[in-house]
């Protein structure tokens, strides 16, 4: 299936130009999406192009500015948050990034009723996290690892925790590993639905080993960055969950929520918290060996002022073939009875589907089924359940939004998006207003992205929110590559691939091939989305064929494929890339003397192992910020897929799956190794060890480090990186500059 038809028309051929590297580095062809900031069933906020904060009412069709750009500019605000009672707005400035999600900022509170900033009892700076209560205008914030509460923005703060200490005790915010590998948020506190209670996590990192690396900066001596970072098999953070009554916070203080006995018996993680009602909360826990998850529903005991988690309200989810869940264990979406819920987990055939759980998991009612997967539950109302899946036309790399009418029997299913803009849009997400009165659909491709507003009852499109007209016009004279998504059937495994072909592609000619790989567990690279990026340029201007292949270990095609890599990372992911390359060669248009592979992060690990596979298939390759040994990576991620690096568990495969063990095999390939020295995620240590092994084996290779850059290699480093990689590939493929 050709996803993006060529835009080359013979009559206009002379006015068309290829993409340039400059186009990519300047972000010339980037797109916009529109996610309404919903504040009710029919109202949303949006920051206009001139930075005014505008409130839109869908039903009246009216809009008005609630906060002017002048007020925003007066404190250099880059973000805002309206209190639910609409009396105040917080303005966020001095944004300072920490890790993937976390940052610190300065916060100002603006009083909408008098048009002035709140003076007196100002917030300290910098704040690590701040949020409004869901009702009214209470504030909870984290400062210096402690949590504070304000009943009103101008009130003095009430200090909830006192033991917060940098790199030791984290209250209301996650430590490094929980932020990156478990919660995927910058916060670890949760308001109850009406703001009566505030739940928070306390992470104790006292005994965690510390990763230390130099940050060179501009001073005479480099700084040392220290992060408590548990690598595979190391001591993990110890987590506790507390809940405090925010109406009378000093009355009994924070109350700890008990951990299920079957979880507490050995090392464990807290994985998520979901409020059900003001007096019912749902916590999810996970054994350190991540194949057992427990969902625990806890109730407030008014008489004791404590939280009770009866064993009858514990639901166990266990995987016998891999780890629990997909990338993360899914979270429940509760029904209106405030006890039963909908959740995605594997069915008996090994496909992730929506189940309805009331009394026990054993009695779960399967809501969706088929040889495809339900991916996300967006919203459950009294009569509808909205979810996304890759069911439509059996393409795993698509996402459509479905509605199941659960208020009647038999429940009927309707695809909301499948036929809306079929050629342009095959990969959607959605954002729902309160009670799903309205929703926004955001289409990511394969055509130019478009965001639209819809009626939640009828699904009728109300208006286009963003259609990227400027991008469409800018692309009119660009020779974009052709893209196709197809599959290979190999030994009972389906390998989906995306191929990006030069605009004037001719099957009778031979082209250099670049494999772009990620290949991490539960990832998906072959997606029907729009992108004009570096590989688009390589196809458009440099005449390369680029291929992306989803092999074993990748997601949304069932547990057989997903869990194939369990306890065996670095084997089948590599095999499947190699198998695909052989199939591509058989297609007849690949120059088998000019094949390269590149990847970043997990992709850098796979590309390194593929280059060192001894097959002779690859002439050259690039690894950006690769993992080189699973002993160097984070416990939560690594152990999920690999178990523990102990003799009685999986140490042998930890040792066998390193890049260093294959140093000798790099002798006959051109290898470019790249890493940021301030990578907090995949530590520079990984590349340092590859380099050391290659030197010790007297194997020639190329390398580039980026001083003080993290895992993302952002800013000017990005330009340097892609320019450098382009030169390397062109040299490898004997393409003239």
């Amino acid at each position: 299936i050709v996803l993006r038809p060529p835009r080359v028309h013979n009559s206009e051929e002379n006015t068309m130009r290829a993409l340039t590297l400059k186009d990519i580095l300047n972000g010339t062809f980037s797109y916009k999406t529109f996610f309404p900031n919903w504040i009710s069933g029919q109202e949303y906020l949006h920051q206009s192009a001139d930075n005014n904060i505008v409130l839109y009412n869908i039903e009246t069709g009216q809009s008005y500015t609630i906060l002017s750009n002048r007020t925003m500019k007066s404190v250099n605000a880059s973000n805002y948050g309206l209190s639910p009672d609409r009396q105040f707005v917080y303005l966020e400035s001095d944004y300072s990034k920490l890790w993937r999600y976390s940052y610190t900022a300065t916060y100002y509170i603006y009083d909408l009723s008098n048009g002035e900033f709140v003076r007196g009892n100002e917030l300290p700076r910098p704040i690590q996290y701040l949020c409004w209560s869901p009702v009214g205008s209470k504030l909870a914030y984290v400062y210096q690892n402690n949590i504070y509460l304000k009943q009103r923005p101008g009130d003095p703060p009430f200090q909830i925790t006192f033991n917060g200490r940098e790199n030791k005790i984290f209250n209301g915010i996650p430590d490094w590993v929980y932020e990156e590998e478990m919660l995927a948020t910058k916060y670890a506190l949760w308001w109850s639905p009406n703001g009566k209670f505030l739940a928070y996590a306390e992470f104790n990192d006292t005994d965690i080993p510390v990763i230390a690396y130099s940050y060179y900066g501009d001073e005479q001596y480099p700084r040392t960055i220290n992060i408590p970072y548990p690598k595979a098999g190391a001591k993990n953070p110890f987590v506790r969950i507390f809940i405090i009554d925010t109406t009378y916070p000093a009355y009994v203080g924070p109350q700890e929520v008990p951990v299920p006995a079957m979880i507490a018996s050995s090392d464990y993680y807290f994985s998520w918290l979901t409020w059900v009602t003001d007096e019912r909360v749902c916590l999810q826990w996970l054994k350190r060996v991540q194949n057992v998850s427990v969902l625990s529903i806890c109730d407030f005991r008014e008489d004791w002022q404590t939280w009770d988690c009866p064993k009858t309200q514990e639901h166990i989810e266990e995987s016998r073939t891999g780890w629990a869940g997909g990338f993360f264990v899914s979270t429940p979406v509760f029904s209106y009875d405030a006890i039963s819920y909908y959740k995605i987990f594997s069915d008996k055939d090994g496909y992730k589907h929506i189940h309805y759980i009331k009394d026990t998991v054993e009695n779960a009612i399967q809501i969706t089924s088929g040889k495809w997967e339900a991916i996300n539950i967006f919203r459950v109302t009294q009569d509808s359940l909205f979810y996304s899946s890759n069911e439509f036309e059996d393409y795993p790399g698509r996402r459509n939004i479905y509605r199941i009418s659960i208020g009647s029997y038999p429940p009927s299913k309707k695809c909301v998006t499948c036929h809306l803009r079929k050629e342009r849009c095959q990969y959607y997400t959605a954002s729902f207003s309160d009670y799903a009165k309205y929703y926004a659909l955001v289409c990511y491709g394969p055509g130019i992205p478009i965001s639209t507003l819809h009626d939640g009852r009828t699904d009728q499109e109300i208006k286009i929110l963003e259609e990227n007209k400027e991008l469409e016009n800018a692309l009119k004279n660009i020779q974009l590559p052709k893209e196709e998504i197809k599959k290979l059937e190999v030994d009972e495994i389906t390998l989906w691939y995306k191929m990006i072909l030069p605009p004037q592609f001719d099957r009778s000619k031979k082209y250099p091939l670049l494999i772009q790989v990620y290949g991490g567990p539960c990832s998906q690279s072959v997606r029907s989305v729009f992108a004009v990026n570096w590989i688009s340029y390589l196809a458009s201007k440099e005449g390369m064929v680029i291929a992306l292949v989803d092999g074993r270990g990748t997601a949304f095609q069932g547990d057989k494929l997903l869990y194939a890599v369990y306890r065996k990372l670095g084997v089948y992911e590599v095999e499947d890339q190699i198998t695909a390359v052989r199939k591509f060669i058989e297609m007849g248009f690949i120059d088998e003397k000019r094949i390269a592979i590149w990847g970043w992060s997990y992709g850098g690990y796979v590309s390194s192992l593929a280059l060192a596979s001894g097959t002779g298939l690859f002439k050259c390759g690039i690894a950006v910020a690769p993992v080189s040994s699973w002993e160097y990576y984070a416990s939560v991620y690594t152990e999920r897929f690999m178990g523990l690096p102990t003799k009685d568990d999986n140490l042998e495969h930890y040792k066998n799956s390193t890049v260093m063990a294959r140093a000798e095999y790099f002798r006959n390939v051109d290898y470019l190794l790249i890493h940021g020295t301030a990578d907090d995620n995949v530590h520079f240590q990984n590349s340092a060890q590859i380099a050391k092994a290659l030197v010790n084996a007297q194997v020639d290779f190329q390398a580039m480090w980026y001083s003080d850059q993290n895992h993302g290699l952002s800013g000017l480093s990005t330009n340097h990186l892609y320019t450098h990689m382009t030169h390397f590939l062109k040299q490898c493929f004997s393409l003239s500059d």
Epitope: S335, Y336, D337, I339, S340, Y356, K358, I365, P410
Partner: antibody, heavy 122, light 107 residues
């Protein structure tokens, strides 16, 4: 008008078998959860078991699980109860009941038949 | 298996009075409770479901309440046709057991 009509009751010897039927009319039988409930003379109601619309889920009260079988034929709008190895304490009035689907995913027993009497005696 | 304990087993009341029948579950049934009325020689009739929702056609003098393990059925201003037996039944987890019943007689 909704009607549920049980039949097949009668006298049966201990250890014997009996098949009860429940003919439904006046509603869309194929979308209803159906149940069997019994009432021993002068006693209260006892839930026997349930069957969902497409017969994919059948649940029984544990004490009767191995001797009673519930089934249905949507084409014939009929619910069945096969009683095996009956004993004297199975003597009762047997009701079939039909339920509306209630959100979320359960039903109520809105419609009841008049019952059929089963007497187990030698 | 959840047990349903209904009380009182019997009570006598006069027309116009208000009566309350209670039902206790051996575990939390989260409002998954129904009440039925059965008159002598007749089939049971659904009165209340979800602990407090009146079934179609049921007079408003009937009302259900409760949560967790404790539930009750209240009949305001008793009418002659209200006399008979009353049963609760939970729908939380199978088996969906009934209470032992309450026989309401005319005083």
């Amino acid at each position: 008008e909704v009607q549920l009509l049980e039949s097949g009751g009668g006298l049966v010897q201990p250890g014997g078998s009996l098949n009860l039927s429940c003919a439904a009319s006046g509603f869309d039988f194929s979308t209803y959860w159906m149940s069997w409930v019994r009432q021993a003379p002068g006693k209260g109601l006892e839930w026997i078991g349930e069957i969902n619309p497409d017969s994919s889920t059948i649940n029984y009260t544990p004490s009767l699980k191995d001797k009673f079988i519930i089934s249905r034929d949507n084409a014939k709008n009929t619910l069945y109860l096969q009683m095996n190895k009956v004993r004297s304490d199975d003597t009762a009035l047997y009701y079939c009941a039909g339920g509306y689907y209630r959100y979320p995913y359960y039903y109520t027993m809105d419609y009841w038949g008049q019952g059929t009497t089963v007497t187990v005696s030698s | 298996e959840l047990q349903m304990t209904q009380s009182p087993a019997s009570l006598s009341a006069s027309v116009g009075e208000t009566v309350t029948i209670t039902c206790r579950a051996s575990g939390n049934i989260h409002n998954y409770l129904a009440w039925y009325q059965q008159k002598q020689g007749k089939s049971p009739q659904l009165l209340v479901y979800n602990a407090k929702t009146l079934a179609d056609g049921v007079p408003s003098r009937f009302s259900g309440s409760g949560s967790g393990t404790q539930y009750s059925l209240k009949i305001n201003s008793l009418q002659p046709e209200d006399f008979g037996s009353y049963y609760c039944q939970h729908f939380w987890s199978t088996p969906y057991t009934f209470g032992g019943g309450t026989k309401l007689e005319i005083k």
